[in-house]
């Protein structure tokens, strides 16, 4: 059974992940970003189901494409280089989903834009956080 300290740690990690994803979304959603229209043509894979921490496997598998698009964004809104930002997210995701069980991610039939993709994972974080508090 999870202890209160492990629950607290999970909550903090989710909050950190949530902030990182929100920062990316704000950075690319900036109305001054002329590249947004072009960036929206990139096809992101969405999870068929995202209700548990193990489903973060689906986010982990999309971090490489996310880094590519962020390199194209070149937004001044990001305090870190895309490579460092994605690396930070990857560390959190690995800790949260754990490495004990190998979960095969199932993707939805429809792809999504980067905005839809980020919103989906932001909602996921918020949902899990709400169950922990």
């Amino acid at each position: 059974a999870p202890t209160s300290s492990s629950t607290k740690k999970t909550q903090l990690q989710l909050e950190h992940l949530l902030l990182d994803l929100q920062m990316i979304l704000n950075g690319i959603n900036n109305y001054k970003n002329p590249k947004l229209t072009r960036m929206l043509t990139f096809k992101f894979y969405m999870p068929k189901k995202a209700t548990e921490l193990k489903h973060l496997q689906c986010l982990e598998e999309e971090l490489k494409p996310l880094e590519e698009v962020l390199n194209l964004a070149q937004s001044k809104n990001f305090h870190l280089r895309p490579r460092d930002l994605i690396s930070n997210i990857n560390v959190i995701v690995l800790e949260l989903k754990g490495s004990e069980t190998t979960f095969m991610c199932e993707y939805a039939d429809e792809t999504a834009t980067i905005v839809e993709f980020l919103n989906r994972w932001i909602t996921f974080c918020q949902s899990i956080i709400s169950t922990l508090t």
């Epitope: 072009r38 990139f42 096809k43 494409p65 590519e68 698009v69 070149q74 039939d109 792809t111």
Partner: antibody, heavy 117, light 106 residues
Framework: QVQLVQSGAEVKKPGASVKVSCKAS????????MHWVRQAPGQGLEWMGR????????KYAPKFQGRVTMTRDTSTSTVYMELSSLRSEDTAVYYC??????????WGQGTTVTVSS | DIQMTQSPSSLSASVGDRVTITCKAS??????LAWYQQKPGKAPKLLIS???SLETGVPSRFSGSGSGTDYTLTISSLQPEDFATYYC????????FGGGTKLEIK
């Protein structure tokens, strides 16, 4: 695993048309863009255009506009590139490639098209 | 169309050498650049996208840098399997490729 398998070599006469196919496996073509790039003997790479298999939308390089047609058959996970009014300068290896957005991460093995009278 | 000028067009180097290939765009391409490696009789292989993002499985001796109109592919320590032709490709506007750099054994 991801694979793109192209149709075999073609020999055509000037003025004719050629239709090259590219069959995908290991992924859903609707979740990608499919591009066509050609390479004349001893020359560099030349982007011809792309199709979005999800809706059939195409974007062609200005040089090929009006002469190239890209289509797809999602039921067989196959994309096609047809080039009309062939001339000797169209002799090249034609590659299909896939992308999630921009850079092509997987390519077909290439199809040699020879235009000769 | 944006023109991509790649230099040098050919280059002789030895195993272990550090090699740099440059690509200059005729207009700003804002990091929307990829690098490919092609061996004779084979299809190109994607090495780097977004100017700096190394593809999964590509050795870390390959790296990309640059901004605006000027971009660079660096191979920190040449290996025998790296001798090939390298192409840059911009995709800020209608995609165009550089003329290629043939990397040969000295």
């Amino acid at each position: 695993q991801v694979q793109l398998v192209q149709s075999g070599a073609e020999v055509k006469k000037p003025g004719a048309s050629v239709k090259v196919s590219c069959k995908a496996s290991g992924f859903n073509i609707k979740n990608t863009y499919m591009h066509w790039v050609r390479q004349a003997p001893g020359q560099g790479l030349e982007w011809m255009g792309r199709i979005d298999p999800a809706n059939g939308n195409t974007k062609y390089a200005p040089k090929f506009q009006g002469r190239v047609t890209m289509t797809r058959d999602t039921s067989t996970s196959t994309v096609y590139m047809e080039l009309s009014s062939l001339r000797s300068e169209d002799t090249a290896v034609y590659y299909c490639g896939r992308s999630r957005g921009y850079a092509m991460d997987y390519w077909g093995q290439g199809t040699t098209v020879t235009v000769s009278s | 169309d944006i023109q991509m000028t790649q230099s040098p067009s050919s280059l002789s180097a030895s195993v272990g050498d550090r090699v740099t290939i440059t690509c200059k765009a005729s207009d700003h391409i804002n990091n929307w650049l990829a690098w490919y490696q092609q061996k004779p009789g084979k299809a190109p292989k994607l090495l780097i996208s977004g100017a700096t993002s190394l593809e999964t499985g590509v050795p870390s001796r390959f790296s990309g840098s640059g901004s605006g109109t000027d971009y660079t592919l660096t191979i920190s320590s040449l290996q025998p399997e790296d001798f090939a032709t390298y192409y840059c490709q911009q995709y800020w506007s209608t995609p165009t490729f550089g003329g290629g750099t043939k990397l040969e054994i000295k």
